[in-house]
């Protein structure tokens, strides 16, 4: 950066090189160039010469004043016009930053995704600070009082093997940068209560012949958790509003859920599960599309999730890939 240049003098910032966005700041430049009584001192911001708000303080020093400085980062340097020198002489340079102190971290959430081997903790960091902000996640055992600290820039994955102080913990997050420090409330957790079952996946759908045509959605999860509650939501792709069906599920076999749907309409399905009675849900599964046939089907066939299908046949949709859910992060 600009701070690595060889200086023939000194540049400094008041109140500091990192300051609160919107402040008035002063940048001072003091020349110390051999055989040079500067005729003029110049300031440059990001390589562009500044023309206003420059005050000469004495023979070697000048001040540049900014009102309501709003740029997150800027490279400043200053030069001197020396007699008998054709070019300006570089005095010194400095990188300056403006931003905000951190907000109090809130919505601290810790979950263990089944089979991951990690406890994942996230939080709402609040408004953008614009400057380097570090987070320390504190995990304190309610049984042994031992505390672990983890330094991070965003969320944290903590190996469950390192949580050796029993099952009950307090978790809190400390946010700090050059402008301040804040700390979240303490979240009390029990490791058995924060497990999110292995992802539920819709594998295929078919609409079969019956007095009233019936669509069966096939879905499964690799979870070993015995008591699991799930929700499946579905809607016509042209609709805004979801319909939701609830299930108490035993994943020892593939689940089959029946729906009576309108013919010749493209539907979208998603599923999510939680350990029964616990706090956190899986994110909604990938979007699964299925189009119902126009007429009562006669024959069984398969069609993929694209819109190609044969009118008048049993229509099957098979999951072929991951489509992004519209709100994957919904674990609350």
């Amino acid at each position: 950066g600009i701070t690595n240049i060889n200086c023939s003098g000194h540049i400094w910032v008041e109140p500091a090189t990192i300051f609160k966005m919107g402040m008035n700041i002063s940048i001072y430049c003091q020349a110390a160039i051999k055989n040079c009584q500067p005729r003029k001192l110049h300031f440059y911001k990001n390589g562009i010469k500044e023309r206003f708000q420059i005050t000469r303080i004495n023979k070697t020093t000048a001040r540049l004043w900014y009102k309501n400085f709003l740029e997150p980062h800027a490279s400043m340097y200053c030069t001197a016009e020396c007699p008998k020198h054709f070019q300006e002489t570089l005095i010194c340079g400095k990188d300056i930053s403006s931003g905000y102190p951190p907000d109090i971290p809130d919505e601290v959430t810790c979950v263990i995704y089944e089979y991951s081997g990690n406890m994942t903790c996230t939080w709402n960091a609040g408004k953008l600070t614009y400057i380097d902000t570090k987070y320390v996640v504190h995990v304190k055992s309610l049984e042994t009082e031992e505390e672990q600290q983890y330094l991070t820039s965003s969320y944290i994955n903590i190996s469950t093997d390192s949580l050796q102080g029993g099952k009950k913990y307090l978790v809190w997050v400390q946010a700090a940068n050059a402008l301040g420090m804040e700390e979240s409330k303490q979240l009390q957790i029990h490791l058995d209560d924060i497990v999110i079952p292995s992802a539920a996946v819709i594998s295929r759908a078919e609409t079969i012949n019956a007095t009233v045509p019936k669509t069966i959605i096939y879905w499964d999860s690799q979870t070993t958790i015995e008591k699991v509650s799930c929700e499946m939501r579905y809607k016509a792709t042209t609709n805004q509003t979801w319909n939701v069906k609830e299930f108490d599920t035993n994943f020892t076999y593939v689940q089959q859920s029946e729906f009576y749907l309108e013919p010749n309409i493209k539907y979208v399905f998603q599923v999510r599960c939680q350990e029964t009675g616990k706090r956190y849900w899986q994110p909604w599964s990938s979007l699964f599309f299925h189009k119902t046939p126009e007429t009562v089907p006669q024959v069984t066939s398969k069609a993929f999730q694209h819109d190609t299908w044969n009118s008048g046949l049993t229509v099957a949709s098979i999951s072929t890939g991951h489509l992004t859910s519209d709100n994957r992060g919904d674990i609350g």
């Epitope: 320390v136 504190h138 304190k140 309610l142 042994t144 009082e145 031992e146 505390e147 672990q148 600290q149 983890y150 330094l151 307090l170 809190w172 400390q174 420090m181 804040e182 700390e183 303490q186």
Partner: antibody, heavy 121, light 112 residues
Framework: QVQLVQSGAEVKKPGSSVKVSCKAS?????????MCWVRQAPGQGLEWMGC?????????YYANWAKGRVTITADESTSTAYMELSSLRSEDTAVYYC????????????WGQGTLVTVSS | DIVMTQSPLSLPVTPGEPASISCQAS??????LAWYLQKPGQSPQLLIY???KLAAGVPDRFSGSGSGTDFTLKISRVEAEDVGVYYC??????????????FGQGTKVEIK
Amino acid sequence: QVQLVQSGAEVKKPGSSVKVSCKASGIDFNSNYYMCWVRQAPGQGLEWMGCIYVGSHVNTYYANWAKGRVTITADESTSTAYMELSSLRSEDTAVYYCATSGSSVLYFKFWGQGTLVTVSS
Amino acid sequence: DIVMTQSPLSLPVTPGEPASISCQASENIYSFLAWYLQKPGQSPQLLIYSASKLAAGVPDRFSGSGSGTDFTLKISRVEAEDVGVYYCQQTNRYSNPDIYNVFGQGTKVEIK
């Protein structure tokens, strides 16, 4: 068994600084631990000054009144913790203790013998 | 800022009789509370941690109880060697930027 041995008594002038050391033996420096400092003015109660947490990273915490005046550091190579108090005034005359449990808990099984710092003009 | 308040501040006791000291936290500190005894001219010594766990080498006439905000230290039968100043200390968290002190004011126990 953890042992904490502190530096000797000091007499200081108002406005100056003092740096008290605390050499620890018996702490597993590969584990996480807190080392804290507590002071006690003559005839007064215990007053927490601050702590240093040493683990995968180092973190320091200070009492509200101590911020800007107290600096706590640790030199793992010599197993020594330091507490520096600047801008001394007569009210800082006290016995200064380092304290730890040798782990990352905040109660103190082990205390240094105390260092008397006298601030007098 | 968590404030620790002890009562009484002075406790005259009779050897062989029970004694009790109370400590109140201004907010929930779970069971993160320690008790210390400081005898004249000595460094403090840990008696109780985690509100109710007896520290190594401490006689079992000492016991601690409580959680949340209200805590008690009991001596079942006071002995002459128990005189000194007793302090409670919150051991929940020191990372909060507003902490002033983590100790109570102290309770002076002396023989009647």
